[in-house]
Interface confidence: low
């Protein structure tokens, strides 16, 4: 017959996990012995392996819940292909019998003895409720047992009495104004509030209780601002060291407006928070180096060359400068002391020229000397010639740049009878005289 | 001496525009031509405009049309006025002076080398795309 088949078998509760499929032989299901099948679906589930014996069921319940029963358990002989030990079928049970106990007896009803006396009225005055009690021993109950009905009954009373009237407070009254204006000075502010037991009065015959608690109450006034505080200063802290490594430096002692600090707008301390003093470390400061101008260039030659002086041939030149001013231990000068470039020699060399533009008008000469002028120039400027602007030295490190040096010889077309430089002077208008701006402020 | 110093760098747009200065103090008669060289991290330092004291004018091909330079002789200053920026414009670009002393009138000669005799500390300028 054909079976659902399912690719596990869950020991512990002896169910079929993991559905395969159905219309499936044993057979071929428990190919597979990891395996389980159902004949039916809700059926009993059987695992593919050898059969062998389930785990024993939990005992069932007492068959009796008082006085001595019994009970039973059961195991499953499970598996497929096989027989449990004691040659037994796969779907065989096997059952266990034991007897048990839930209680050793069982319960048994009591009766009620006769009704006690009534207790006092509940009230001393107006009217209440009294009580009476019976037992539940005529006799006991056995085993857990009880007796019907209920144990005590209760009826109304009257006590022929007027009750007095204990005395209730009327509201509070309104709170009277703060006793201060700020919190935090000397008297703290409080506002007072007080009552009348009038809500009722206690009775007189027969006497009530008067009210419980006091009159009055008094509380702290919020929402007022916080009373003024003056600053005041904190000692003076120690002095700073010196500042400096060298030369003269300053010192300085501070103190905190602290002693207390103002709040609430009190005044802030009166004088200064920092006193200073001078320091002398009697050690002169380094001087660092400063580099001079540079120095002119030198004459643009090539090396085994007598000149290359109006020649397409570049040569090299050098200009140096020196680091001056360096005392007790300065920095050195920083970068080069010596700068070399590419270059072409036009020293004295005839060049065609052309006349410049006007130059600008130059300062006014002597400048505090007496019918001071100022001049511009036009220039004989020399048409440099076209050689190439930049060269290649050595292999395999670029193109270097290559300037034009020396003082060429530049021929112009005479200019107001001048060849090389024309000047135009003016004198220097509305002159004013040179005074010490020191001087002046005296 | 003459000493140059730049002003108006900073990062910009793509297709923004900038205004470089550069004033001149010292000795500012010996000054003929001024010019603007930039140099790209890892490139060449190049020409990019320069100006004699005349008013002439060249500029490199790279920016003909965008860049212009100018003069104002009354305050020693020159200016390179830059449109149409773009991410290649990005590098130092650094103020130079010609000593009419030391090169004479070069620009007439359409001349390109290094002639420069003074030269500021340079002002970065970065486009980003």
């Known amino acids: 017959d054909p079976v659902l088949c399912f690719t596990q078998y869950e020991e512990s509760s002896g169910k079929c996990k993991g559905l395969l499929g159905g219309g499936v032989s044993v057979e071929d299901c428990c190919l597979n012995t990891a395996f389980a099948y159902q004949k039916r679906s809700g059926g009993l589930c059987q695992p593919c392996r050898s059969p062998r014996w389930s785990l024993w069921s939990t005992w069932a319940p007492c068959s009796v819940t008082c006085s001595e029963g019994s009970q039973l358990r059961y195991r499953r002989c499970v598996g497929w292909n096989g027989q449990c030990s004691g040659k037994v079928a796969p779907g065989t049970l096997e059952w266990q019998l034991q007897a048990c106990e839930d209680q050793q007896c069982c319960p048994e009803m009591g009766g009620w003895s006769g009704w006690g006396p009534w207790e006092p009225c509940s009230v001393t005055c107006s009217k209440g409720t009294r009580t009476r009690r019976r037992a539940c021993n005529h006799p006991a109950p056995k085993c857990g047992g009880h007796c019907p009905g209920q144990a005590q009954e209760s009826e109304a009373c009257d006590t022929q009495q007027v009750c007095p009237t204990h005395g209730a407070w009327a509201t509070w009254g309104p709170w009277t104004p703060c006793s201060a204006s700020c919190h935090g000075g000397p008297h703290e502010p409080k506002e007072t509030r007080s009552r009348k037991c009038s809500a009722p009065e206690p009775s007189q015959k027969p006497p009530g209780k008067p009210c419980p608690g006091l009159a009055y109450e008094q509380r702290r006034c919020t929402g007022l601002p916080p009373c003024p505080v003056a600053g005041g200063w904190g000692p003076w802290g120690p002095v700073s060291p010196c500042p400096v490594t060298c030369g003269l430096g300053q010192t300085m002692e501070q103190r905190t407006c602290n002693h207390p600090v103002p709040q609430h707008g009190g005044p802030f301390c009166a004088g200064d928070a920092t006193r200073t003093h001078i320091c002398n470390t009697a050690v002169p400061c380094p001087v660092d180096g400063e580099w001079d101008s540079w120095g002119e260039w030198s004459p643009c030659i090539r090396r085994n060359m007598k000149s290359i002086s109006c020649q397409e041939i570049p040569g090299q030149q050098s200009r140096g400068r020196t680091c001056r001013g360096r005392k007790f231990d300065g920095h050195r000068c920083a970068g080069q002391q010596q700068d070399i470039r590419h270059c072409y020699s036009i020293q004295h060399c005839p060049l065609k020229g052309s006349w410049s533009e006007w130059s600008t008008w130059g300062l006014c000469m002597p400048p505090c000397g007496p019918n001071p002028t100022r001049a511009r120039q036009r220039l004989c400027t020399p048409l440099l010639p076209k050689y190439p602007p930049t060269v290649s030295m050595v292999e395999g490190q670029g193109e270097k740049n290559v300037t034009f040096w020396g003082r060429p010889l530049p021929r112009c077309e005479e200019l107001q009878g001048q060849k090389l430089v024309v000047e135009e002077k003016r004198p220097c208008l509305h002159v004013p005289a040179c005074k010490d701006p020191e001087e002046e402020e005296l | 001496q003459v000493q140059l110093m730049e002003s108006g760098g900073g990062e910009v747009q793509a297709g923004g525009s900038l205004r470089l200065s550069c004033a001149a103090s010292?000795?500012?008669?010996?000054?003929?031509?001024m010019g603007w060289y930039r140099q790209a991290p890892g490139k060449q330092r190049e020409l990019v405009a320069d100006?004699?004291?005349?008013?002439?004018?060249q500029y490199a091909d790279s920016v003909k049309g965008r860049f212009t330079i100018s003069r104002d002789n009354a305050k020693n200053t020159v200016y390179l006025q830059m449109n149409s920026l773009k991410p290649e414009d990005t590098a130092v670009y650094t103020c130079?002076?010609?000593?009419?002393?030391?090169?004479?009138?070069?620009?007439?000669?359409?001349?390109?080398?290094?002639?420069?005799?003074?030269w500021g500390q340079g002002t970065q300028v970065t486009v980003s795309g």
């Open positions: 130079a002076a010609e000593s009419i002393r030391e090169s004479q009138n070069r620009h007439q000669l359409g001349y390109m080398g290094p002639l420069y005799d003074y």
């Open positions: 010292g000795s500012i008669f010996d000054i003929s031509a």
């Open positions: 100006i004699t004291s005349s008013g002439s004018t």
